[in-house]
């Protein structure tokens, strides 16, 4: 079996997590993708998903999460803006492939958000705020609610550096709201 590994990100409140998840483009380009959080002993919880079928370079925003699927490159870009301490936790990208179980993409992301903005010049606090303030045009998201029970047992023990609490929730707007935002880098 493929060993589950984590890539760790330590960020300050107000900053942006900006990561990618690679996938096999020949197989999954148009498949619906999702961003999930894994709580100890719980089923992975879907926080945001792309449309079905997934559209190329078409940003979808759910609260503070922005997903952008680059079909040409076989990768999903995930941004979590204006990070809060409560966002700390273990995250993963998955590909929905009904009727089969979701396909998990490696590696998982261990996010640790700490209090107090770093205040360094050129930090990403300002660059994320204008993203968050883009006026929304809202539609309904259709994120499948099922997840593989097998992925629960695969969740590694929580890192000692993980400052989230088991019952802390990601502070999002209604997860059914999808906001379209223009493409930007």
């Amino acid at each position: 079996a493929t060993k589950l590994t984590e890539e760790k990100y330590e960020l300050k409140e107000g900053q942006t997590l900006d990561v990618k998840c690679d996938y096999t483009l020949e197989k999954f380009a148009s498949s619906q993708k999702a961003w999930q959080i894994i709580r100890d002993g719980e089923m992975p919880k879907t926080l945001a998903c792309t449309e079905r079928p997934s559209k190329n370079s078409h940003p979808v925003q759910v609260g503070r999460i922005i997903l952008e699927d680059y079909h040409d490159h076989g990768l999903l870009r995930v941004r979590m803006v204006n990070l809060q301490v409560e966002d700390s936790g273990l995250y993963q990208c998955v590909i929905y492939q009904p009727p089969k179980e979701p396909h998990m993409l490696f590696d998982r992301i261990r996010l640790v958000v700490t209090k107090g903005f770093s205040g360094t010049p050129g930090s990403n606090e300002n660059s994320t705020q204008n993203v968050y303030k883009i006026p929304p045009t809202t539609t309904k998201a259709l994120c499948p609610l099922y997840t593989s029970p097998r992925t629960v047992t695969q969740a590694p023990p929580k890192s000692t550096a993980d400052v989230s609490t088991p019952d802390s929730e990601i502070n999002l707007t209604n997860v059914t709201d999808i906001i379209r935002v223009p493409v930007f880098n």
Partner: antibody, heavy 119, light 108 residues
Framework: EVQLLESGGGLVQPGGSLRLSCAAS????????MSWVRQAPGKGLEWVSA????????YYADSVKGRFTISRDNSKNTLYLQMNSLRAEDTAVYYC????????????WGQGTMVTVSS | DIQLTQSPSSVSASVGDRVTITCRAS??????LAWYQQKPGKAPKLLIY???SLQSGVPSRFSGSGSGTDFTLTISSLQPEDFATYYC??????????FGGGTKVEIK
């Protein structure tokens, strides 16, 4: 232990060809994008080419486009760089490197193989 | 392609000094920036990824900051083994990658 081992370097005449190989071990090779990066004697690092985990996407620096071809054999855990129409300015140490999954940074590098293009 | 300008090109410092190296991108690259250390005759070694995340096994005296176009690598207290050349590297989401010109940290 995660390891990358390059081979295939050597002396070649201008206009000639060479094929570099990079044997990977200690990780699930097929799930990671891979790159070739070179360094001319006394110079800085120059990215040459990259390939997605499945091999479906390939990328090249303008300086080698049309002359170099990157490929991979996931069944052999091996990355390749086919170099044609070699020029003196291609003389360098060539490194293969593994990308992290979540970023475009290169977290594991081989020891490098020297390519000398000279008549 | 996005260009990276590193400064200074070289710096002379003593053990225990705080050393700061900057890297400026020609356009916004969010946090898609990495820092590497290279010693003569050796392969580069990843120090910092995603602008500020410390690679596993790298001493905590190394830190990275910045986002957008301006980035900094800081060595809080220079150690004898830190004398080397440092490179920044970017790739917004996917290649092409580009490297900065390098900064050589020399013994004063």
């Amino acid at each position: 232990e995660v390891q990358l081992l390059e081979s295939g370097g050597g002396l070649v005449q201008p206009g000639g060809s060479l094929r570099l190989s990079c044997a990977a071990s200690g990780f699930t090779f097929s799930t990671y994008a891979m790159s070739w990066v070179r360094q001319a004697p006394g110079k800085g690092l120059e990215w040459v080419s990259a390939i997605s985990g499945s091999g479906g996407s390939t990328y090249y620096a303008d300086s080698v486009k049309g002359r170099f071809t990157i490929s991979r054999d996931n069944s052999k855990n091996t990355l390749y760089l086919q170099m044609n129409s070699l020029r003196a300015e291609d003389t360098a140490v060539y490194y293969c490197a593994k990308s992290k999954h979540s970023t475009t940074s290169l977290d594991v590098w081989g020891q490098g193989t020297m390519v000398t293009v000279s008549s | 392609d996005i260009q990276l300008t590193q400064s200074p090109s070289s710096v002379s410092a003593s053990v225990g000094d705080r050393v700061t190296i900057t890297c400026r991108a020609s356009q916004d690259i969010s946090s898609w920036l990495a820092w590497y250390q290279q010693k003569p005759g050796k392969a580069p070694k990843l120090l910092i990824y995603a602008a500020s995340s410390l690679q596993s096994g790298v001493p905590s005296r190394f830190s990275g900051s910045g986002s957008g176009t301006d980035f900094t690598l800081t060595i809080s207290s220079l150690q004898p083994e830190d004398f080397a050349t440092y490179y920044c590297q970017q790739a917004v989401i996917h290649p092409p990658y580009t490297f900065g010109g390098g900064t050589k940290v020399e013994i004063k």
